[in-house]
């Protein structure tokens, strides 16, 4: 292997290293091996268990495990104390396979069976007849018979014809080995004679024969060439009088035959010789020459080989004459004698002259096999029979061994070269690569030269080693007072506020980013901007909403700031834009029954009239509770009552009976007798005088206001209309007295009825 410039023989990042003698080798990275580091180290993932050592086979890229004492197996995974080694359980030549640390399985030799191959395979003698399946259980066999056979060995044919009814329509049952057949009467067919027979449907002619119906139950088959029989079932044997030669076997075909030839012959009738030398290029091995012959071939072997195919090496040691004490090694058509120490020569018959170490300076000593004298192979730099003379390499006539005008200096057994500047190596053959030390800085490219180098600088650098950075700021490229910062092969301008661009040439429109908030107007300046705020906002960016609640404008309430406005949320009892007005809770006249309303903050107070009470004077004391009206109906008022008197009574409490006789209604000296709500005239005896109205019809004066008058001669009686009461039907009946309105509803009395005003959440005639 040679390590040369521009040629990298090592793969997988291997490093080519040169020895002193000029040859090289590949130093492989971890995980690779082989002459060129071309193989993955198979020991990289060490699979060897129990302290086993992984041994890599570099040429194959494979690995084997060298197991520690007491272990075995491909990966040293099994202990030698495993049952396979200790109890050797597999008998009769069976092979033990280790399944786990404790378990095993035996693979038995032919003729044996059982978990440990302990039983002779009873099936080996094929005891089961008629295609049945044989299984071994212990040392016994068991036969599983096919349908139609029975017996321990399935040797007995079942006679299916013993059971009647197999064949229908009078068919005859014929027992066959393992089955039966029905022979059907004319007119029937099928396996059980269960189908009506129609000739040619289906066609009974086989092998492509054509069926022709010749009668009700008869047919005829026209057979293809090569077949015969009533259904063309027989292939005519074409082999009689065949022409197969040279041991060819005739194989009958359809209307023809073929010859199966022995390997040495070919052709239709095995008459053509096979050229084995052409068909099998390696018929003769080890360089033997193949000669084709009729019906075979022969090999002419090269010296040292024999046998039909020249595969046998002739044992030349059988006739060799190696000196006693030496070892004969057979080779191809020759032999060699391996001599004991002190002996030499082809037959080890000479004394070894090298035994006295005649060769100096580390020379190799060889014995001449013909005469036993020594021959010294001198190392470089020495010569002479025993290698004691120094070779002056510098005085050699042909050329100076030092290249590139190097000076040659001879030394004992060698020489050395004093090289000119820029060259190195044992013979000054190497141009020193001054670039090897990476002298060029800042990613520059190094060009090697004789005795020196040149750096090709990257843009932005200069100097011998490209160590100097070019100052791109020297030309003051930044405008508008921009500050220049020198970078590698470029510059950067740090622009003052209000300017941008590579050289600060662009005046920034500070308003372009819409910095002003809340609808403010932006005014651009050379170095900034100004925000003109909309009403209600303040701050540099008009970001602040002016607090219109400072000072607090709300008198009796809480101020909520808006945009250029505020809202007063009034405390209970106050109203108005700034909660300055006290709400007049008396405005809605909440006090009933003539109660007097006094306005308060967030409220009111009712001063009730005598006879009433409640928050709103809604409770009227019942002045009628003591039934003050003697002969009348009591009407409750506020702190008073009034009596509606029954007819014939008067007075504040209807306790005074009206004297109807006071108006002297009786004429002609008649006597007036006062009654309840009426009078009676007792006329003088004799004929009645019209003016003596002893029998006055009191209904004539229509006393019943809301009703009908009855029986007016001796007093009257009113039959009131619905909703009215009283002697003269003058009193509206109060239907609210029975409290018909439910769930806190308010009752309004109507003529002959009432109306309920329901509280929130209730409805219906009675708020039910």
């Amino acid at each position: 292997l040679q390590c040369r410039d521009g040629y990298e023989p090592c793969v997988n990042e291997g490093m080519c290293v040169t020895y002193h003698n000029g040859t090289g080798y590949c130093k492989c990275p971890e995980g690779f091996l082989g002459e060129y580091c071309q193989h993955r180290d198979p020991c990289e993932k060490n699979r060897c268990q129990n302290g086993g050592t992984c041994v890599a086979q570099a040429m194959l890229g494979k690995a084997t495990c060298r197991c520690a004492s007491g272990f075995t197996g491909e990966d040293c995974q099994y202990s030698t104390s495993h049952p396979c080694f200790v109890s050797r359980p597999c008998l009769n030549g069976g092979t033990c396979h280790m399944l786990s640390r404790d378990t095993y399985e035996c693979t038995c030799q032919v003729g044996f069976t059982g978990k440990e191959c302990q039983w002779t395979d009873a099936c080996l003698s094929h005891p089961c007849a008629n295609g049945s399946t044989c299984t071994t259980v212990a040392n016994q066999f068991s036969c599983k018979c096919l349908t139609g056979f029975t017996g321990q060995k399935c040797e007995t044919d079942v006679n299916e014809c013993d059971i009647p009814g197999h064949c229908q329509h009078g068919g005859t049952c014929l027992n066959l080995p393992g089955s039966y057949q029905c022979q059907c009467p004319q007119g029937f067919t099928g396996q059980y004679c269960d189908s009506l027979y129609v000739p040619c449907a289906p066609s009974p002619c086989v092998n492509g024969g054509t069926c022709r119906q010749t009668g009700d139950f008869t047919f005829e088959c026209n057979c293809l060439p090569g077949f015969e029989g009533s259904t063309c079932e027989r292939n005519i044997d074409d082999c009689p009088n065949h022409r197969c030669q040279n041991g060819g076997v005739c194989v009958d075909g359809v209307n023809t035959y073929n010859c199966r030839c022995p390997p040495q012959w070919t052709g239709q009738f095995c008459t053509e010789d096979v050229d084995e030398c052409l068909l099998q290029p390696n018929a003769c091995q080890n360089g033997g020459t193949c000669a084709n012959r009729n019906g075979g071939y022969g090999c002419v072997c090269v010296n040292g080989w024999s046998g039909d195919d020249c595969s046998e090496n002739i044992d030349d040691c059988a006739f060799a004459s190696c000196t006693p004490g030496s070892t004969c090694i057979d080779r191809v058509a020759s032999f060699s004698c391996m001599c004991p120490e002190g002996k030499a020569g082809l037959l080890c018959h000479l004394d070894d002259a090298c035994i006295s170490n005649p060769c100096h300076k580390g020379a190799l000593c060889d014995t001449n096999p013909l005469n036993g004298q020594y021959i010294c192979t001198c190392p470089q730099g020495y010569k002479g029979a025993d290698c004691t003379e120094d070779v002056d390499e510098c005085a050699m006539a042909n050329s100076n061994p030092c290249e590139h005008a190097g000076k040659c200096v001879n030394t004992d057994g060698a020489f050395h070269c004093e090289c000119l500047k820029g060259y190195a190596g044992p013979r000054c053959e190497m141009d020193i690569n001054e670039c090897h030390s990476d002298p060029c800085q800042n990613d520059a490219t190094c060009l090697d030269k004789i005795g020196g180098f040149t750096c090709l600088c990257m843009p932005g650098f200069k100097g011998v080693h490209c160590e100097l950075e070019i100052n791109e700021c020297q030309s003051n490229p930044c405008v508008n007072n921009g500050q220049c910062v020198d970078k590698v092969n470029r510059f950067q301008c740090l622009c003052p506020p209000g300017f941008t661009g590579p050289v600060c040439q662009i005046d920034i429109d500070d308003c372009s980013s819409t910095p002003c908030l809340n609808g403010a107007k932006c005014i651009d300046h050379p170095n900034g901007y100004e925000c003109q705020c909309a009403t209600g906002f303040t701050g540099v960016l008009c970001e602040e909403n002016i607090d219109n609640c400072d000072p607090d404008p709300c008198h009796h309430g809480q101020c909520q700031d808006g945009i250029d406005s505020y809202t007063c949320i009034c405390n209970p009892g106050y109203m108005g834009a700034i909660c300055s007005d006290q709400i007049d809770e008396c405005y809605s006249s909440p006090c009933l029954n003539d109660g007097r309303c006094i306005d308060l903050v967030n409220g009111y107070q009712c001063n009730c009239q005598p006879g009433t009470s409640g928050v709103n004077c809604e409770i009227n004391f019942d002045d009628c509770a003591s039934n003050p009206c003697i002969h009348g109906i009591c009407m409750d008022g506020i702190n008073r009552y009034s009596c509606v008197c029954s007819p014939g009574f008067t007075g504040q409490r209807c306790n005074i009976d009206i004297d109807e006789c006071a108006s002297n209604p009786c004429r002609k000296g008649a006597t007036c007798i006062n009654g309840v709500n009426g009078f009676r005239c007792i006329c003088p005896e004799g004929p009645h005088h019209p003016s003596c109205y002893s029998q006055v019809n009191e209904c004539l004066s229509n006393p019943c206001i809301h009703g009908n008058c009855t029986g007016g001669l001796s007093g009257y009686k009113c039959l009131c209309d619905a909703g009215w009461v009283g002697i003269n039907c003058e009193v509206d009946k109060n239907e609210c007295l029975s409290n018909p309105c439910q769930n806190g509803g308010t009752c309004d009395n109507l003529v002959n009825g009432y109306r309920c005003t329901c509280k929130k959440g209730f409805k219906g005639y009675n708020c039910q």
Epitope: V86, L91, T103, E116
Partner: nanobody, 116 residues
């Protein structure tokens, strides 16, 4: 859980006999080869004898060959060691071991002492 319980040990005079038993449970006894191993005072574990799973194959250490007989009854899940012609060198704790005698499951052992 694999359990092996040895019994039958004891004190015996040189030339005497003992029969050790090992009752197995917690695994299919008939699927495993079984071993007898022993440990003499102050010494390491020593293999004595082995029998295959079916009982058809047996092997013995040279030191006990001809004197000890290993057997098994798979129906009773029991392993036996018949020890004849005992000598003082046979004094040890005897263990029955399943499968690989060095790493397989082992019982608690039974003490055998041969002394006059």
């Amino acid at each position: 859980e694999v359990q092996l319980v040895e019994s039958g040990g004891g004190l015996v005079q040189p030339g005497g006999s003992l029969r050790l038993s090992c009752a197995a449970s917690g695994f299919t006894f008939g699927d495993y080869a079984m071993n007898w191993v022993r440990q003499a005072p102050g010494k390491g574990l020593e293999w004595v004898s082995s029998i295959s799973a079916g009982g058809y194959s047996t092997t013995y250490a040279d030191s006990v060959k001809g004197r000890f007989t290993i057997s098994r009854d798979n129906a009773k899940n029991t392993l036996y060691l018949q020890m004849n012609s005992l000598n003082p060198e046979d004094t040890a704790v005897y263990y029955c071991a399943r499968g690989d005698w060095r790493y397989g499951s082992r019982g608690q052992g039974t003490q055998v002492t041969v002394s006059s």
